[in-house]
């Protein structure tokens, strides 16, 4: 269920709000709708930087739950094939609060386009 | 700065269709954004009514449903609303927003414009 | 009935401190956002996010959230404070956006 990947984005960015994270994550920011599966799948591989860098059990525990939850959301779409995609290093690399308000705005995409 | 400006008529007949356009301006339609409607009845809170995406996804207020069309119009860098079957229930300011990227927000918004239901 | 609750009214003496507060259970998954409206005028965005402030909108406008409640927080009001404010966020579905029923605040 898409909203509660949404709600453990919003566990994450409370977690955050008290740590200093220097990365910078490969952020899309302007979704093609045919192609959110692979822009999402980007999302949340740069997810397990932010769970690398910040070394904390509960974002660790937070960013797991999440990929696991996405994942089940994304495979109930069906295999979805899309091409002509951006790569996830071709993308922007942004901060973690730019990062998280695009992966918001993607999830977002996912529950109103549903 | 993004501006936007609504326009339409100021008067409905009861059972009519109210229409409006939201003139979008210093920005494109075509952004990440997704365009929305919201109406104030006099002295009462906000409602939203719907919600468009430049692809033309929407999502409307489920207590309006029926009754509303939101579409978009890229060469003219606008979107409208058209309600059906009003009744004075549907008098109120209607305003079109801009929703902020991410969390939930309306981060520019029209000046709105007074629609009156009455015969 | 609204799926996010606001206290009516609300006041504050020039210069003191007041919070809003805006209840939901839709809030534990979605922060809120809260817009200042004067009669007459349209809303305007005064916080988004976990406390996020649009430039322009000043520092003593600051947001909140605990569990299901949002609060706005107004730190040494102003006359010109005087206003409408009303809650905003997503529904539990995720799909649709709601409002609170806003709060009119009064500063004495």
């Known amino acids: 269920n898409w909203v509660n990947v949404i709600s453990d984005l919003k566990k994450i960015e409370d977690l955050i709000q008290s740590m200093h994270i220097d990365a910078t994550l490969y952020t899309e920011s302007d979704v093609h709708p045919s192609c959110k599966v692979t822009a999402m799948k980007c999302f949340l591989l740069e997810l397990q930087v932010i769970s690398l860098e910040s070394g904390d059990a509960s974002i660790h525990d937070t960013v797991e739950n999440l990929i696991i939850l996405a994942n089940n959301s994304l495979s109930s779409n069906g295999n979805v094939t899309e091409s002509g995609c951006k790569e996830c290093e071709e993308l922007e690399e942004k901060n973690i609060k730019e990062f998280l308000q695009s992966f918001v705005h993607i999830v977002q995409m996912f529950i109103n386009t549903s | 700065q993004v501006q936007l400006q609504e326009s339409g008529p100021g008067l409905v007949k009861p059972s009519g269709t109210l229409s409006l356009t939201c003139a979008v301006s210093?920005?494109?339609?075509?952004?990440?954004?997704?365009w929305s409607w919201v109406r104030q009845p006099p002295g009462k809170g906000l409602e939203w009514i719907g919600e468009?995406?430049?692809?033309?996804?929407?999502n409307y207020n489920p207590s309006l449903k029926s009754r509303v069309t939101i579409s978009v119009d890229k060469s003219k860098n606008q979107f409208s609303l058209k309600l059906i079957s009003v009744t004075a229930a549907d008098t109120a300011v209607y305003y079109c927003?801009?929703?902020?990227?991410?969390?939930?927000?309306?981060?520019?918004w029209g000046q709105g414009t007074l629609v009156t239901v009455s015969s | 009935s609204s799926e996010l609750t606001q206290d009516p009214a609300a006041s504050v003496a020039l210069g003191q401190t007041v919070r809003i507060t805006c209840q939901g259970d839709t809030l534990r998954n979605y922060y809120a956002s809260w817009y200042q409206q004067k009669p007459g005028q349209a809303p305007i965005l005064v916080i988004y996010g976990k406390n996020n402030r649009p430039s322009g909108i000043p520092d003593r406008f600051s947001g909140s959230s605990s569990g299901n409640t949002a609060s706005l927080t107004i730190t040494g009001a102003q006359a010109e404070d005087e206003a409408d404010y009303y809650c905003n966020s997503r529904d539990f579905s995720g799909k649709n956006l709601v409002f609170g029923g806003g709060t009119k605040l009064t500063v004495l």
């Open positions: 927003a801009r929703e902020g990227i991410g969390w939930p927000s309306f981060d520019y």
């Open positions: 210093g920005g494109s339609i075509s952004s990440s954004n997704w």
């Open positions: 468009i995406y430049h692809y033309g996804y929407t």
